[in-house]
Interface confidence: low
């Protein structure tokens, strides 16, 4: 394992405290506790973190002191299980405390909630935030870590430290600026959007490890790192994949101190060996640790080596294909994936994995046949339709996006997905379809060579959100099937779903379409969400409604909101005009 082979330490907690330093140690313990006990008040978590930190210091002073030899899971689990209100607040999660390690930690992991019942974070006035920041900077930043971690229980902990550093920098700069709001608000918006994206990307990594196993994650990592570092040797990529898998397994498993420590070691190794990895790492490697790790994770693909030979020679034409495959199946398939991915930065990772799976299936079948070479000779021909399917889909959807713009493109997807899986809750359909719709502005601006990796890998992240939210309360067999059968075929599985003909339309409820004057004070985004929620409900009432019918109703709805928001007596307008709108909509849709 190279980087991660460490000497045995008498005290694991002392070792991590010394490696990470007090500030990072405290921040990571706070993140870990907030991700496990998502409902606990901030003050309770701070108290627990301080107790753990004091204990860690005693172990640094004397590694042989009492309890210093205990594992981190034992120490942290014991501390979490001292929370007095565990049973009342968390119900059956309290049963975890009756278990021994490692089962207790596994039990806590099982109870992480992707959609916790927490109030939406409301941003206070800028002056209020700046005062709080100046009054107690440490508490202010801890609160940020706590609020993000409890809402995103799989957030990549070392990356959250990087976000907190940027959060601090934004307040340090902007609270002294002449126009505090103009300086601060765009920075906070950017951090919020980037944070949501980072959380969703990490959630997919954890789902990949937890649901499909280490082999699936390693395959993903081989493909992605081979695209990013096409000049690196296969052995180098394999080593990075092994180390990266360890880092993410630790973070997804709640071992945040080990994860952060190992991520720092991996960044150090990459920078010490950049000559044999990539020519694009120079700037990243000059940055401080948190920025360096983030930069490496986001670094652009290196240029492909010139004159790479044809893949067919080693993987189709060679007489030794079956011999090489039989000797070490996963290594041979890994080499295939590496060679294919380094030649194709223009493909999505999931497409590369589909190609590798097709290649594997063909070899399994053909290496047992009478004439293996004859059998697998045309294997690359089987790749053509697999490549064309996402290319065509992206082309069509980018054309639609360019024609409609983001909001209406989202609406088209809302209708499409509600018809496919109408049993899914309306908030989930709105959230997921809005995010699916963002693929347009995110990826369609790119040239052809960058569109597919941008679009399809982003869609994998968004569809994973649907999968984890649906798993909490499963309502649709079709969603379960697409989410669980194959990680790399999730998007094609959802794309292939037609209208659910078995769905019994929802009863019409006028209350769902009753609006009030408060809609006028909402931001544009919030108003869009209200309208999109109504659109999903319409489709659930009338799944066979045509595009034209739905468009007419939505246009009427937009006009109604605009009219009443301009009226002197807004509430009366919403009440009277709303009744007319509901009646007209029912007539238009034949409800």
């Amino acid at each position: 394992r190279g980087v991660f082979r460490r000497d045995a330490h008498k005290s694991e907690v002392a070792h991590r405290f010394k490696d990470l330093g007090e500030e990072n140690f405290k921040a990571l313990v706070l993140i870990a506790f907030a991700q496990y006990l998502q409902q606990c008040p901030f003050e309770d978590h701070v108290k627990l973190v301080n107790e753990v930190t004091e204990f860690a210091k005693t172990c640094v002073a004397d590694e042989s002191a009492e309890n210093c030899d205990k594992s981190l899971h034992t120490l942290f689990g014991d501390k979490l299980c001292t929370v007095a209100t565990l049973r009342e607040t968390y119900g059956e999660m309290a049963d975890c405390c009756a278990k021994q390690e490692p089962e207790r930690n596994e039990c806590f992991l099982q109870h992480k909630d992707d959609n916790p019942n927490l109030p939406r974070l409301v941003r206070p006035e800028v002056d209020v935030m700046c005062t709080a920041f100046h009054d107690n900077e440490e508490t202010f930043l801890k609160k940020y870590l706590y609020e993000i971690a409890r809402r995103h229980p799989y957030f990549y902990a070392p990356e959250l430290l990087f976000f907190a550093k940027r959060y601090k920098a934004a307040f340090t700069e902007c609270c002294q600026a002449a126009d505090k709001a103009a300086c601060l608000l765009p920075k906070l918006d950017e951090l919020r959007d980037e944070g949501k994206a980072s959380s969703a990307k990490q959630r997919l990594k954890c789902a990949s490890l937890q649901k499909f196993g280490e082999r699936a994650f390693k395959a993903w990592a081989v493909a992605r790192l081979s695209q990013r570092f096409p000049k690196a040797e296969f052995a180098e990529v394999s080593k990075l994949v092994t180390d990266l898998t360890k880092v993410h397994t630790e973070c997804c498993h709640g071992d945040l101190l080990e994860c952060a420590d190992d991520r720092a070691d991996l960044a150090k190794y990459i920078c010490e060996n950049q000559d044999s990895i990539s020519s694009k790492l120079k700037e990243c490697c000059e940055k401080p640790l948190l920025e360096k790790s983030h930069c490496i994770a986001e670094v652009e693909n290196d240029e492909m080596p010139a004159d790479l030979p044809s893949l067919a020679a080693d993987f189709v034409e060679s007489k030794d294909v079956c011999k090489n495959y039989a000797e070490a199946k996963d290594v041979f398939l890994g080499m295939f994936l590496y060679e294919y991915a380094r030649r194709h930065p223009d493909y999505s990772v999931v497409l590369l994995l589909r190609l590798a799976k097709t290649y594997e299936t063909t070899l399994e079948k053909c290496c047992a046949a009478a004439d293996p070479h004859e059998c697998y000779a045309k294997v690359f021909d089987e790749f053509k339709p697999l490549v064309e399917e996402p290319q065509n889909l992206i082309k069509q959807n980018c054309e639609l996006f360019e024609q409609l713009g983001e909001y209406k493109f989202q609406n088209a997807l809302l209708v499409r997905y509600t018809k496919k899986v109408p049993q899914v809750s309306t908030p989930t359909l709105v959230e997921v379809s809005r995010n699916l719709g963002k693929v347009g502005s995110k990826c369609c601006k790119h040239p052809e060579a960058k569109r597919m990796p941008c679009a399809e890998d982003y869609l994998s992240v968004v569809l994973n959100q649907l999968c984890v939210l649906h798993e909490k309360t499963p309502v649709s067999d079709r969603v379960t099937k697409c989410c669980t059968e194959s990680l790399v075929n999730r998007r094609p599985c959802f794309s292939a779903l037609e209208v659910d003909e078995t769905y019994v339309p929802k009863e019409f409820n006028a209350e769902t379409f009753t609006f009030h004057a408060d809609i006028c004070t909402l931001s544009e985004k919030e108003r869009q969400i209200k309208k999109q929620t109504a659109l999903v409900e319409l489709v659930k009432h009338k799944p066979k409604a045509t595009k034209e019918q739905l468009k007419a109703v939505m246009d009427d709805f937009a006009a109604f909101v605009e009219k009443c928001c301009k009226a002197d007596d807004k509430e009366t307008c919403f009440a009277e005009e709303g009744k007319k709108l509901v009646a007209a909509s029912q007539a238009a849709l034949g409800l």
Epitope: P102, E103, E106, C107, L109, Q110, L209, Q210, K211, F212, G213, E214, R215, A216, H253, T480, T484, E485
Partner: nanobody, 126 residues
């Protein structure tokens, strides 16, 4: 390729106990997610209990929680199902199933398990 062989089924009175075993060969059992399913006459195959690959994270169907315990002995490459407080409705053929790739989480969907044993019959009757 994983081969699975169940044993330990039989006739038992209501309230009694049985311990099923599933011996695996061809792959280390701790590298696969393994589960017990059961199928009663005329009914669909249903998930009973499961354990993740690489870590001992366990899952149970609501109908058996508190009565059944799944475990594995890596040194013997064997999966177990300890069944206590048995009821007549537990009567079924019990199957052991494996899903390689070290998934940490067990799936409850039978179709996702490529490897199956031949089953062992458990009859609960007075």
């Amino acid at each position: 390729e994983v081969q699975l062989l169940e044993s330990g089924g039989g006739l038992v009175q209501p309230g009694g106990s049985l311990r099923l075993s599933c011996a695996a060969s061809g792959r280390y059992i701790d590298e696969t997610a393994v589960a017990w399913f059961r199928q009663a006459p005329g009914k669909e195959r249903e998930f009973v209990a499961g354990i993740g690959g690489g870590v001992d994270i366990t899952y149970y169907a609501d109908s058996v929680k508190g009565r059944f315990t799944i475990s594995r002995d890596n040194s013997k490459n064997t999966l177990y199902l300890q069944m206590n407080s048995l009821r007549p409705e537990d009567t079924a053929v019990y199957y052991c199933a494996a899903r390689p790739g070290r998934p940490l989480i067990t799936e409850k969907v039978a179709d996702l398990y490529p490897y199956w044993g031949q089953g062992t019959l458990v009859t609960v009757s007075s």
